[in-house]
């Protein structure tokens, strides 16, 4: 059945399925040290982990993809773990004359799903 | 450099990078034959292919993910190819009293990007 296991329980074991994980990154890591002043380090939430059949399906397309991957694994890839929503982030930019604040809406993941 | 190749030219060769591909699927493949009457076969556009560094980045998060994957490949996954938009599809449903039409907005991919 399409609902052999609940969509939010991971059949692969703890921490293996699509979830949010924090990665520490410096401005140097990001290649931003020439144009961002603060923060010097970012706690970046990213989506990692596998997407077993129907786990956290983003939408109907993802459910179809999961099913067809089961039938034609060489032709149709499994859904993959991507952000479903984002947390806005404010950065302090270097400008020609000094600094300014800018908010980025698509920088840090807040939630994940399988698409 | 972050822009060593244009975001839309595939460095892996033709057809290897993230793109839209058509997959033929029957109602039986989808497990829908008991509740969908038409169409009997769907031309499903799906997103397939790899996401090399900065290729078709969905947003800033995807660019960061690509960069950090280069630095910490075991910890940060590469971006993956998912739909950026969808084409609505009309399905003819079986109902208790006959048939009805229903539009699905998230069934068939129209465009792809790397997220």
């Amino acid at each position: 059945s399409a609902h052999a296991h609940p969509r939010d329980s991971c059949p692969l074991g703890p921490g293996r399925c699509c979830h949010l994980e924090t990665v520490q990154a410096t401005l140097e890591d990001l290649g931003w040290s020439d144009w961002v002043l603060s923060p010097r380090q970012l706690q970046l939430s990213m989506c990692v982990g596998e997407c077993p059949h129907l786990y956290r399906s983003a939408n109907t397309h993802a459910q179809i993809k999961a099913r067809l991957h089961g039938l034609q694994p060489d032709k149709v890839p499994a859904p993959c773990c991507v952000p479903s929503s984002y947390t806005p982030v404010v950065l302090m930019h270097r400008t020609d004359s000094g600094v300014s604040l800018q908010t980025y809406d698509d920088l840090v993941a807040r939630g994940c799903h399988c698409a | 450099s972050a822009h060593a190749h244009p975001r839309d030219s595939c460095p892996l060769g033709p057809g290897r990078c993230c793109h839209l591909e058509t997959v033929q699927a029957t109602l039986e493949d989808l497990g829908w034959s008991d509740w969908v009457l038409s169409p009997r076969q769907l031309q499903l556009s799906m997103c397939v292919g790899e996401c090399p560094h900065l290729y078709r980045s969905a947003n800033t998060h995807a660019q960061i993910k690509a960069r950090l994957h280069g630095l910490q490949p075991d910890k940060v996954p590469a971006p993956c190819c998912v739909p950026s938009s969808y084409t609505p599809v009309v399905l003819m449903h079986r109902t208790d009293s006959g048939v009805s039409l229903q539009t699905y907005d998230d069934l068939v991919a129209r465009g792809c990007h790397c997220a």
Epitope: S38, Q43, P88, V89, V90, M92 | -
Partner: antibody
Framework: QVQLQESGPGLLKPSQTLSLTCTVS??????????VGWIRQPAGKGLEWLAN???????YYNSALKSRLTISKDTSKNQVSLKLSSVTAADTAVYYC??????????WGQGTLVTVSS | DIQMTQSPSTLSASVGDRVTITCKAS??????VAWYQQKPGQPPKALIY???YRYSGVPDRFSGSGSGTDFTLTISSLQAEDVAVYYC?????????FGQGTKLEIK
């Protein structure tokens, strides 16, 4: 554009608890890197930092006043609240809330005057 | 707590003068110092971030410098509208602390 508006009781009696609210617009209290701080200024005197709260709910307090201060936020209402217990005449001041970004105060409210008198 | 000591407490200068206000931290704060301007009856306004970066919209006659324990705010050519009290603030560590302020007047 960014705006902050303080509201408070205006006049309190000694030993009462001061409750202040800062309503913000033009930015989200859940934005990474964003905080709201409270600063007060007695008439003719300098600025004294009281407390702040960050997007992730981290809170910091002025060490001398820590036992009397409580800061909280309601992200859905875009509000930050500050409570100062057991007030005395020495707590009479203009109280400002300010948008805090990575440690500094980028935008300030107009301030609200609080007088403690019996 | 880190103490921030400003000097002078009051400063009188003429329009067009170059004006310098100093701020000394009681311990190393790196470049984690901000400067604010407060005009009579108004809230403070951000001028300088990270010791030397002018905030957007701040006239370029204002500049900041310094690191460690010694910091300077300079107005290259004093204007009448610059009459205000100026404050430094450290944000290197909690609790955040301000200098006591420098009152700038026109001669």
């Amino acid at each position: 554009q960014v705006q902050l508006q303080e509201s408070g009781p205006g006049l309190l009696k000694p030993s009462q608890t001061l409750s202040l609210t800062c309503t913000v617009s033009g930015f989200s209290l859940s934005t990474y890197g964003m905080g709201v701080g409270w600063i007060r200024q007695p008439a003719g005197k300098g600025l004294e930092w009281l407390a702040n709260i960050w997007w992730n709910d981290d809170k910091y307090y002025n060490s001398a006043l820590k036992s009397r201060l409580t800061i909280s936020k309601d992200t859905s209402k875009n509000q930050v609240s500050l409570k100062l217990s057991s007030v005395t005449a020495a707590d009479t001041a203009v109280y400002y809330c300010a948008q805090e970004v990575y440690g500094w105060f980028a935008y300030w409210g107009q301030g609200t005057l609080v007088t403690v008198s019996s | 707590d880190i103490q921030m000591t400003q000097s002078p407490s009051t400063l009188s200068a003429s329009v067009g003068d170059r004006v310098t206000i100093t701020c000394k931290a009681s311990q190393n704060v790196g470049t984690n110092v901000a400067w604010y301007q407060q005009k009579p009856g108004q809230p403070p306004k951000a001028l300088i971030y990270s010791a030397s970066y002018r905030y957007s919209g701040v006239p370029d006659r204002f500049s900041g410098s310094g690191s460690g324990t010694d910091f300077t705010l300079t107005i290259s050519s004093l204007q009448a509208e610059d009459v205000a009290v100026y404050y430094c603030q450290q944000y290197n560590s909690y609790p955040l602390t301000f200098g006591q302020g420098t009152k700038l007047e026109i001669k």
